[in-house]
Amino acid sequence: MMTGTIETTGNISAEKGGSIILQCHLSSTTAQVTQVNWEQQDQLLAICNADLGWHISPSFKDRVAPGPGLGLTLQSLTVNDTGEYFCIYHTYPDGTYTGRIFLEVLESSVAEHGARFQIP
């Protein structure tokens, strides 16, 4: 039975040209995380495999940094980065857990930074 829950940064905003941390946290389960996929709509940004480590998709290599932890740092943000991001946790023996984050990249310097995992 899947007992775990994923806590995410939820809806967040950031300033164009800045950076943001996407963070998910899996709790309430003793299942082992075997791989975390970070995806944007149908695009794979990065994976972190428990054995093989991080692998960043080539098209994002210049703007995506692994971590902290199982999170993902997006850099040099553009307005086109606005949208849904998904953390997909593969676990044994539970199966797959998915968390959703909505990122809005703002032109102005009044981007709100209120999310739980957000860095200033």
Epitope: Q32, T34, Q35, L44, S57, P58
Partner: antibody, heavy 116, light 106 residues
Framework: QVQLVQSGAEVKKPGSSVKVSCKAS????????IEWVRQAPGQGLEWMGE????????NYNEKFKGRVTITADKSTSTAYMELSSLRSEDTAVYYC?????????WGQGTLVTVSS | DIVMTQSPDSLAVSLGERATINCSAS?????IHWYQQKPGQPPKLLIY???NLASGVPDRFSGSGSGTDFTLTISSLQAEDVAVYYC?????????FGGGTKLEIK
């Protein structure tokens, strides 16, 4: 359900090359590493290399570098392992396997026999 | 390369008895995986990350250990457990397997 189906047995001459295919189904091929492992008759398992199909990124066992090339075709969800300059000691069963929390699904194996 | 040494090479155990297979790494590793291979079949994931049973594996199988010394235990051997067992490390590339332990019924 997850399946990895490999190409059929091959008989090759020393010095030639062989290309083994591994067709994946039942999961999103581009999202997970595929590894290649071989097993000589009556022997143990030997890791050859791996590919992340989503990007084409590869890692190889230094022992095979220059002789092995691993590729993937996302459009057909197929991974390939090509081994060149074959010698008799390359006679083995070659396996592909998906990597998710260790090698959790394996192909059925492809016997490659190198003989003059 | 990290060398994984399994002992014994072969083991004969009576049905219902305990079977123990050892795996020793030439340098310290974080964890290992165990695979079971039956004749004419590909290997099958048995235990991942030292002690976690893979999906569908009976709980008579268990794994333990740390550092350089690891153990696979079958608490009560069944006829279907006859196979070759391999350990594998993912600590340092190239990923290496042990030489295998052939388990038979006495």
């Amino acid at each position: 359900q997850v399946q990895l189906v490999q190409s059929g047995a091959e008989v090759k001459k020393p010095g030639s090359s062989v290309k083994v295919s591994c067709k994946a189904s039942g999961y999103t091929f581009s999202r997970y590493w595929i590894e290649w492992v071989r097993q000589a008759p009556g022997q143990g398992l030997e890791w050859m290399g791996e590919i992340f199909p989503g990007s084409g990124g590869t890692n190889y066992n230094e022992k095979f570098k220059g002789r092995v090339t691993i590729t993937a075709d996302k459009s057909t969800s197929t991974a390939y392992m090509e081994l060149s300059s074959l010698r008799s000691e390359d006679t083995a069963v070659y396996y592909c396997a998906r990597h998710l929390g260790a090698l959790d699904y394996w192909g059925q194996g492809t016997l490659v026999t190198v003989s003059s | 390369d990290i060398v994984m040494t399994q002992s014994p090479d072969s083991l004969a155990v009576s049905l219902g008895e305990r079977a123990t297979i050892n795996c020793s790494a030439s340098s310290s590793v974080s964890y290992i995986h165990w695979y079971q291979q039956k004749p004419g079949q590909p290997p099958k994931l048995l235990i991942y990350r030292t002690s976690n049973l893979a999906s569908g594996v009976p709980d008579r199988f268990s794994g333990s250990g740390s550092g350089t010394d690891f153990t696979l235990t079958i608490s009560s051997l069944q006829a279907e457990d006859v196979a070759v067992y391999y350990c594998q490390q993912y600590h340092s590339n190239p990923w290496t397997f042990g030489g295998g332990t052939k388990l038979e019924i006495k």
